[in-house]
């Protein structure tokens, strides 16, 4: 029987910069029941606080609700593992909420086949940013990525859309049913999950184009 091994805080995420959650990985348990506690202070403070919510994020997590989350202060945190034989501490971790945002997927993805008389046909798609993200503040820039594939294909084709919320694709296989998805990330945050798939049937008379795609 031994003291617990060193835990590691390995992940912190915020859906919208207003709340965030951090998760740790326990070290070895030393063969005894082990208790974990997360303590933190914010930059400019010396007073240590204990994790306000060990429940919301699931096992080995600490959730910081709205009243505990500040975008303007770096959090300095550490996990303590304790059993009957002793204690061990994780390395200190520094968290700036700006850099851990993982938004919800974009919303309202719509996909249409456009067949203008004077130009080659193309696939046109548009979407909306996730509702929890406040883009009006200016500092929150979302980047988007699209992926699509014929229904029975194994490989996805991906396109980076930058900050646009609409996109054209010119090269598709006629007569195929395509799945289309979109995801987003802040410039220094993390990719969202992919949006639910939208299906689109490409007409059999859709003319393939040599130019692959272009931004709207």
């Amino acid at each position: 029987q031994l003291p617990p091994g060193k835990p590691e805080i390995f992940k912190c995420r915020s859906p919208n910069k207003e709340t965030f959650t951090c998760w740790w990985r326990p070290g070895t348990d030393g063969g005894l029941p082990t208790n974990y506690s997360l303590t933190y202070h914010r930059e400019g403070e010396t007073l240590m606080h204990e994790c306000p919510d060990y429940i919301t994020g699931g096992p080995n997590s600490c959730h910081f609700g709205k009243q505990y989350t500040s975008m303007w202060r770096t959090y300095v945190m550490m996990v303590n593992a304790t059993n009957q034989m002793g204690s061990s501490f994780s390395d200190e971790l520094y968290v700036d909420v700006t850099y851990i945002v993982q938004p919800d997927p974009p919303l309202e993805l719509t996909v249409e086949v456009k067949q203008p008389e004077d130009r080659k046909p193309y696939l046109w798609m548009k979407w909306s940013p996730p509702t929890l993200i406040d883009l009006k503040t200016g500092w929150f820039t979302l980047l988007y990525e699209i992926r699509l594939k014929p229904e029975k294909a194994a490989e996805w084709e991906t396109h980076f859309a930058g900050q646009q919320t609409e996109f054209k694709i010119l090269s598709l296989h006629p007569g195929q049913k395509y799945l289309v998805q979109v995801r987003c990330k802040p410039d220094h945050g993390y990719w969202s999950a992919w949006s639910p798939a939208t299906f689109i049937q490409i007409p059999s008379d859709f003319i393939m184009n040599d130019h692959h795609h272009h931004h709207h």
């Epitope: 590691e8 390995f10 992940k11 912190c12 990985r25 930059e43 400019g44 975008m71 303007w72 770096t74 390395d91 971790l93 520094y94 968290v95 700036d96 700006t98 850099y99 851990i100 503040t137 200016g138 500092w139 990330k185 220094h188 993390y190 990719w191």
Partner: antibody, heavy 118, light 112 residues
Framework: EVQLVQSGAEVKKPGSSVKVSCKAS????????IHWVRQAPGQGLEWIGE????????NYNQKFKGRVTITVDKSTSTAYMELSSLRSEDTAVYYC???????????WGQGTLVTVSS | DVVMTQTPLSLSVTPGQPASISCRSS???????????LHWYLQKPGQSPQLLIY???NRFSGVPDRFSGSGSGTDFTLKISRVEAEDVGVYFC?????????FGGGTKVEIK
């Protein structure tokens, strides 16, 4: 203990490429961004670019865009910085550095001297 | 790119005496999220840089309290209240508000 261990010194000809490695240990590699910074002899520091090892998303200094490629190998917890079309002005010590969930550099590799000379 | 200008270029200090280094940026370092990402690094002779101060005034873990940072907007200062022999090296200010991140040219601190 967090460690970033870089590959050894290189001597390269003008016009060639160099690939410097940075092996990380002591933490979960995919958790934190890795940055590359260089320092020419007797000079200041210059940021080259950064990579998020979780998804290989990169940002580059426009000055190096087109000549630099930053990659990772998650299976070996190693980041790489490849610089092409080398010229004598690229002679420098190249550092990898790691952030936390922040945008400043808490841990640095020991540096790799790249000498470009004909 | 944001230009970071440090003064003085070098500084010779008697042990136990204070030292001050100035850093000026060519544009405001206040991020649109309200934070100011101005940091100070020390590069001791023959070593890699090490973080001293993050976000203007916050000492990194293990940094002695004789180091302090202050400033706002475009003007920033690093102070060492009582210089010790182990403080010799080149001090760099750095900004990570704007991409590309940039560094000052460095201030070399020597002991008299």
């Amino acid at each position: 203990e967090v460690q970033l261990v870089q590959s050894g010194a290189e001597v390269k000809k003008p016009g060639s490429s160099v690939k410097v490695s940075c092996k990380a240990s002591g933490y979960t590699f995919t958790s934190y961004w890795i940055h590359w910074v260089r320092q020419a002899p007797g000079q200041g520091l210059e940021w080259i670019g950064e990579i998020d090892p979780s998804d290989s998303y990169t940002n580059y200094n426009q000055k190096f865009k087109g000549r630099v490629t930053i990659t990772v190998d998650k299976s070996t917890s190693t980041a790489y910085m490849e610089l092409s079309s080398l010229r004598s002005e690229d002679t420098a010590v190249y550092y990898c550095a790691r952030s936390f969930f922040t945008n400043w550099f808490a841990y640095w590799g020991q540096g790799t001297l790249v000498t470009v000379s004909s | 790119d944001v230009v970071m200008t440090q003064t003085p270029l070098s500084l010779s200090v008697t042990p136990g005496q204070p030292a001050s280094i100035s850093c000026r940026s060519s544009q405001s370092l206040v991020h649109s999220n309200g934070n100011t990402y101005l940091h100070w690094y020390l590069q001791k002779p023959g070593q890699s840089p090490q973080l001293l101060i993050y976000k203007v005034s916050n000492r990194f873990s293990g940094v002695p309290d004789r180091f302090s940072g202050s400033g706002s907007g475009t003007d920033f200062t690093l102070k060492i209240s009582r210089v010790e022999a182990e403080d010799v090296g080149v001090y760099f200010c750095s900004q990570s508000t704007h991409v590309p991140f940039t560094f000052g040219g460095g201030t070399k601190v020597e002991i008299k």
